[in-house]
């Protein structure tokens, strides 16, 4: 049987049954999520569920820049350190950097400090790049 690889929207990249869009636009976390949703196809800020997925994403983003943190779909909506993925994925894989999780930092970003392989919490109203994801 011939299995056709699903195609992603122009400018998005494909990895293991998902499409990813890296947006170098400056948005706060909630606006970034809204913008992801506006692209349709069930897109949300990206969930990152394995080291392999994290590595693929990190390699792609490093081709554009290596200094700006990037919003992902992990947040702490109740502000109780109960983190969850906005797309409903199970919060099993974790890749937090050793930084403190304190303060008013309830949204997660891929940190540029470790080539985008680890996450940091940040204030959700900060404007920065973001990564969207959907399953085609």
């Amino acid at each position: 049987d011939i299995i056709m690889r699903p195609s992603c929207a122009p400018g998005w990249f494909y990895h293991k049954s998902n499409c990813y869009g890296y947006f170098r636009k400056l948005r706060n976390w909630s606006d970034a999520e809204l913008e992801c949703q506006s692209y349709g196809n069930g897109a949300h800020l990206a969930s990152i569920l394995s080291l392999k997925e994290a590595s693929t994403i990190a390699e792609y983003i490093s081709g554009y820049q290596r200094s700006q943190p990037i919003w992902i779909g992990l947040h702490d909506p109740q502000k109780r350190q109960q983190w969850q993925w906005i797309d409903g994925a199970m919060y099993l894989y974790r890749s937090w950097s050793g930084k403190s999780m304190g303060g008013n930092k309830h949204c997660a970003e891929m940190s540029s400090n470790n080539n985008f392989l680890t996450w940091s919490s940040n204030e959700c109203n900060k404007r920065q790049h973001f990564l969207c994801k959907y399953r085609p």
Partner: antibody
Framework: EVQLLESGGGLVQPGGSLRLSCAAS????????MSWVRQAPGKGLEWVSA????????YYADSVKGRFTISRDNSKNTLYLQMNSLRAEDTAVYYC????????????WGRGTMVTVSS | DIQLTQSPSSLSASVGDKVTIACRPS??????LAWYQQKPGKPPRLLIY???TLESGVPSRFSGSGSGTYFTLTISSLQPEDFATYYC?????????FGQGTRLEIK
């Protein structure tokens, strides 16, 4: 072909109001964030305001925050800028610009409409 | 806000010349830099984005390079239609900002 056509400019007294419109065609309007950028006579470019494709998110330069309101009507493919409490320093050509899909830069621009604030 | 300082402010050159315009951000930015061309009475036109990516339809004599706090726009062989004002723009930090412009005139 992408086209952006501004209208609504003119002469207004300080403290007055004006509403600019930008009619868009040649692309799926609701899929793109849009922006207003202005240029005072003989001066450089200054970003003024932006709005997401859905209209749910808006952004403003500090110089116009609280005085200007950006909005859009996706059913009419039209972008608006409501300008209140106008000042002499708001005198400029106002350009409607489409924000690039991946970056906060401007890939298409209208021809501009002149706003003059003077008594 | 990130300030962008362009140099020179104005430049006289002849058809066929190679010219370079510099743009210096007040703090380091990533690849989030664009260049625009503007002719009198016309809107700006996007030339280059992400430092060095040519916008569709822009002649290959235009090129961009740089990183951090120093970026350049180079025109390898000036054509009559290239005489205009050029602006850099950063979209690395909010709000987006423009340089003050470089006016390129015929010598």
């Amino acid at each position: 072909e992408v086209q952006l056509l501004e209208s609504g400019g003119g002469l207004v007294q300080p403290g007055g109001s004006l509403r600019l419109s930008c009619a868009a065609s040649g692309f799926t309007f609701s899929s793109y964030a849009m922006s207003w950028v202005r240029q005072a006579p003989g001066k450089g470019l200054e970003w003024v305001s932006a709005i997401s494709g859905s209209g749910g998110s808006t952004y403003y330069a500090d110089s116009v925050k609280g005085r200007f309101t950006i909005s859009r009507d996706n059913s009419k493919n039209t972008l608006y800028l409501q300008m209140n409490s106008l000042r002499a320093e708001d005198t400029a050509v106002y350009y409607c610009a489409r924000i690039h899909n991946w970056n906060d830069m401007f890939d298409y621009w209208g021809r501009g409409t002149m706003v003059t604030v003077s008594s | 806000d990130i300030q962008l300082t362009q140099s020179p402010s104005s430049l006289s050159a002849s058809v066929g010349d190679k010219v370079t315009i510099a743009c210096r951000p007040s703090q380091g930015i990533s690849s989030a830099l664009a260049w625009y061309q503007q002719k009198p009475g016309k809107p700006p036109r996007l030339l280059i984005y992400d430092v060095s990516t040519l916008e569709s339809g822009v002649p290959s004599r235009f090129s961009g390079s740089g990183s951090g706090t120093y970026f350049t726009l180079t025109i390898s062989s000036l054509q009559p239609e290239d005489f205009a004002t050029y602006y850099c723009q950063q979209f690395d930090n909010y709000p987006v900002t423009f340089g003050q412009g470089t006016r390129l005139e015929i010598k």
